[in-house]
C-alpha cells in the first residue's frame, strides 16, 4: 500500500498524458485524481506506464469503486486488465459484447488466463445463455473455448448459436460434449439440403446415434476417415458392412489403415468375414463363416 502524501505543488494532474510516466509511484498516488483517471481510462493504454505505475492506477480505481468498476471504465481498461484478479472481476457486471472483445484483445495470443475465464463466466451468466454473437467472439479468440465447457454448461447453448461453430472449435471436445452439441446442430441445420447439411453436421457427428448414421449412409455423403474414427463406438457397431461402405464411399479404402484402432477394430469383430470380404480390402478378424451370432443384449432385455 502506498502511504498518503500530499501532491507537490504544480504536479497535480489536469489530464492523463505522457508526462505522468515520469511520476514516482507516490506522486501518482497523490497527484492523479481517481475520478479523472476513470473518465480518461482510454488514454492509459497509449502511455508506456511501468507495471509498478499500473499497480498504483489500479489501486486508485479500487478505492473509487470498491463494489466493482462500472462498464464505462472496464471497456477502456486495456493492459490494466492484466492486473486484475479473478476476485476483482467477480464484482463486475459486463453486459456489452464490445467490452468483452476489448478485454479479450488484451489477452490475445495467450492461453486463457483465470482472469479471462472469470470474465467470460460473468458475461455468459449475465446474458443467461451463449448466444451466437458471443460464441462467435469467444471461439474467434479461443478456438478451444466450446470444448472447455461442461456438458451442463453446453446445454444452455441455443441451437441458433451452433451456426457460429467452426470445425476447429470442436477439435478437443470429448464424446460427452458432442452428445450435447449434436442434437442442437441437427436442429440448427435441419432445413439444409443433403450435401450442405453433411458439410455442416460433419464436425458434430461424434455425438450421432446409429439411426442417424444409417440415414446418412443412404445419402452418398463420402465421410472421411478422420470423421469416422471420431464416431461413437456404440453407434458404429450396429452398422452393416454395406452401410459403412455407403457411408464412406471411396474413403472405405482407409479402413485397412485403421483396422487395429477403435471404432474400426471393434466393428470388424462384429461383422461376418464373408461380409468383410465384399469390401475387398483384406480386412481380417470377422466372425468366421458358419458361426452363429447370438445377441445376448437382446436376450437380457426380453428376460
Amino acid at each position: 500500500e502506498v502511504e498518503k502524501t500530499a501532491c507537490p505543488s504544480g504536479k497535480k494532474a489536469r489530464e492523463i498524458d505522457e508526462s505522468l510516466i515520469f511520476y514516482k509511484k507516490w506522486e501518482l498516488e497523490a497527484c492523479v485524481d481517481a475520478a479523472l483517471l476513470a473518465t480518461q481510462m482510454d488514454r492509459v493504454n497509449a502511455i508506456p506506464f511501468t507495471y509498478e505505475q499500473l499497480d498504483v492506477l489500479k489501486h486508485k480505481l479500487d478505492e473509487l469503486y470498491p463494489q466493482g468498476y462500472p462498464e464505462s471504465v472496464i471497456q477502456h481498461l486495456g493492459y490494466l486488465f492484466l492486473k486484475m484478479s479473478p476476485e476483482d472481476i467477480r464484482k463486475w457486471n459486463v453486459t456489452s459484447l464490445e467490452t468483452l472483445k476489448a478485454l479479450l484483445e488484451v489477452n490475445k495470443g495467450h492461453e486463457m488466463s483465470p482472469q479471462v475465464a472469470t470474465l467470460i463466466d460473468r458475461f455468459v451468466k449475465g446474458r443467461g445463455q451463449l448466444d451466437k454473437d458471443t460464441l462467435d467472439t469467444l471461439t474467434a479468440f479461443y478456438p478451444g473455448y466450446l470444448c472447455s465447457l461442461s456438458p451442463e454448461e453446453l446445454s444452455s447453448v441455443p441451437p441458433s448459436s451452433i451456426w457460429a461453430v467452426r470445425p476447429q472449435d470442436l477439435d478437443t471436445c470429448d464424446p460427452r460434449q458432442l452428445d450435447v452439441l449434436y442434437p442442437k446442430a441437427r436442429l440448427a441445420f435441419q432445413n439444409m439440403n443433403g450435401s450442405e447439411y453433411f458439410v455442416k453436421i460433419q464436425s458434430f457427428l461424434g455425438g450421432a446415434p446409429t439411426e442417424d448414421l444409417k440415414a446418412l449412409s443412404q445419402q452418398n455423403v463420402s465421410m472421411d476417415l478422420a470423421t469416422f474414427m471420431k464416431l461413437r463406438t456404440d453407434a458404429v457397431l450396429p452398422l452393416t458392412v454395406a452401410e459403412v461402405q455407403k457411408l464412406l464411399g471411396p474413403h472405405v479404402e482407409g479402413l485397412k489403415a485403421e483396422e487395429r484402432h477403435r471404432p474400426v477394430r471393434d466393428w470388424i469383430l462384429r461383422q461376418r468375414q464373408d461380409d468383410l470380404d465384399t469390401l475387398g480390402l483384406g480386412l481380417q478378424g470377422g466372425i468366421p463363416n458358419g458361426y452363429l451370432v447370438l445377441d445376448l443384449s437382446m436376450q437380457e432385455a426380453l428376460s
Epitope: 464411399g249 471411396p250 470380404d277 465384399t278 475387398g280 480390402l281 483384406g282
Partner: antibody, heavy 114, light 107 residues
C-alpha cells in the same frame, strides 16, 4: 508362400483374343480386389481395371472397357484378363496386383505379331 | 478421372545425395496415395502407402509426405540399389491412375 503366379509369355496374332491368368496362393483370395496393370516396352504403368472375387464387381478403365474382360475362378483362386481384337498396341507386360499393392505378379509378356 | 502428374520425368544423382520426387493429383485424394519403385525387367515394388506409411521391409531412407493434391517421396543418402523408376498411384476410387514415372539415374 504368398504369391501371384503368371505365365511368362503369350504370343498371339493380330485380331485374335487372349486370356491371361494369375493364380493367387498363400492368402485369402476372396478378401482382396485384384487389379490388372499394363506396361508397354519403355513406358509407364497403366491401370486396366479391378475385380472383387467375392461380389464379382468390376471396374474398368474406360479406354479398355470394350476389349477387356475381367473374371475370377474362386475354386482355383485364379484371376483372368481377356483381351479381344488384339493389335500391336497391345504388346506389353501385363501384371496382376493385389489390392493393397504389396503383391504383384511377375507379369506376362504379351506379343502380338503375325 | 483423377490425373496424376509426376515430376521430374528424369533425375540424375550421385550416391549419398538426397532427392525428392513430387506427385500432383488433379483433385483432392486426401492421403490415398502409393509410391512404387521399379527396376528394369522387374515388377514394381510398393514403397509407401497412405501417402506416408512405409511398406514392410522398405529402408527408412525413404519417406513419403503430403495430402490433398500435393505429395512427395524423399530418398535420403542414395544407395546404388535405389536407382530405377518411381511411380505414384492414387488409391481413391477408380480408375486408379499412375503418375508418368520418374527415372532416377546414377550421375
Amino acid at each position: 508362400q504368398v504369391q501371384l503366379q503368371q505365365p511368362g509369355t503369350e504370343l498371339v496374332k493380330p485380331g485374335a483374343s487372349v486370356r491371361l491368368s494369375c493364380r493367387a496362393s498363400g492368402y485369402s483370395f476372396s478378401s482382396y480386389w485384384m487389379h490388372w496393370v499394363k506396361q508397354r516396352p519403355g513406358q509407364g504403368l497403366e491401370w486396366l481395371g479391378n475385380i472383387n472375387p467375392t461380389t464379382g464387381d468390376i471396374n474398368y478403365n474406360e479406354k479398355f472397357r470394350n476389349r477387356a474382360t475381367l473374371a475370377v475362378d474362386k475354386s482355383s483362386t485364379t484371376a483372368y484378363l481377356q483381351l479381344t481384337s488384339l493389335t500391336s498396341e497391345d504388346s506389353a507386360v501385363y501384371f496382376c496386383v493385389r489390392h493393397d499393392g504389396f503383391l504383384w505378379g511377375q507379369g506376362t509378356t504379351l506379343t502380338v505379331s503375325s | 478421372d483423377i490425373q496424376m502428374t509426376q515430376s521430374p520425368a528424369s533425375l540424375s544423382a550421385s550416391v549419398g545425395e538426397t532427392v525428392t520426387i513430387t506427385c500432383r493429383a488433379s483433385e483432392n485424394i486426401y492421403s490415398y496415395l502409393a509410391w512404387y519403385q521399379q527396376k528394369q525387367g522387374k515388377s514394381p515394388q510398393l514403397l509407401v502407402y497412405y501417402a506416408k506409411t512405409l511398406a514392410e521391409g522398405v529402408s527408412s531412407r525413404f519417406s513419403g509426405s503430403g495430402s490433398g493434391t500435393q505429395f512427395s517421396l524423399k530418398i535420403n543418402s542414395l544407395q546404388p540399389e535405389d536407382f530405377g523408376t518411381y511411380y505414384c498411384q492414387h488409391q481413391f476410387g477408380t480408375p486408379r491412375t499412375f503418375g508418368g514415372g520418374t527415372k532416377l539415374e546414377i550421375r
